[in-house]
Amino acid sequence: YDFTNCDFEKIKAAYLSTISKDLITYMSGTKSTEFNNTVSCSNRPHCLTEIQSLTFNPTAGCASLAKEMFAMKTKAALAIWCPGYSETQINATQAMKKRRKRKVTTNKCLEQVSQLQGLWRRFNRPLLKQQ
């Protein structure tokens, strides 16, 4: 999906209003310095591409974040404010249902969500020069 035509200000408002709080809740009990940010993004569409990938694609050591509250809200925000996004996700959702696993918070998942927090922060500051 090409995130170029999303309403970035609405997605930012959704993040600041509620998604950010869910990410903090997920990370509660973890020091903010515990993980290094290794994933970056260069502009808002790129940030959303990385956020979608890290939120919804299973990785080694973190099978699925998709059922977490922050993930459900992220998916909803993209569906609302990215035209045509929902339609592109129907097949992906059906595939995900087939391989659904029970929720387990592993250290790898915590690291992944820490990366997500960094991507969202970057998304919210699009004019900032890349380090």
Epitope: D7, K10, A13, S17, T18, K73, A76, A77, I80
Partner: nanobody, 132 residues
């Protein structure tokens, strides 16, 4: 030019009823979500009730469930808030607000409808006072 015009506020006794109206113009009413917000003196804006003019889906704040009913008349471009069993704590300025994408994505909007930062257009407000 987009306009939202609220009316119907006033003074009512505890236990009484009022019906607020929000008349809209200047945008495609049938695609939009309209939400009633309220602000009591010294308090934050609170989302009260949401309706999608696209599919009629509604959401309510817990504090008004069972007492308030939101409805829409697309032929008149107007949204109503029927408020029954009013309490002193319902005293506030009531605003209606419109958003252009949450109307056609009402199920996904369950997470976001009550957040004022997401709305594009606002009315000027109508004061509701509940007092004996």
């Amino acid at each position: 030019e987009v306009q939202l015009l609220e009316s119907g506020g006033g003074l009512v006794q505890p236990g009484g009823s009022l019906r607020l109206s929000c008349a809209a113009s200047g945008f495609t009413f049938g695609d939009y979500a309209i939400t009633w917000f309220r602000q009591a003196p010294g308090k934050e804006l609170e989302g009260v009730a949401y309706i999608s003019n696209f599919d009629g889906m509604t959401y309510y704040a817990d504090s008004v469930k069972g007492r308030f009913t939101i409805s829409s008349d697309n032929s008149k471009n107007t949204v109503y808030l029927q408020m029954n069993s009013l309490r002193a704590e319902d005293t506030a300025v009531y605003y209606c607000a419109a958003e252009g994408r949450m109307g056609t994505h009402s199920r996904d909007s369950v997470y976001f409808w009550a957040f004022s930062a997401l709305y594009d257009y606002w009315g000027q407000g109508t004061l509701v006072t509940v007092s004996s």
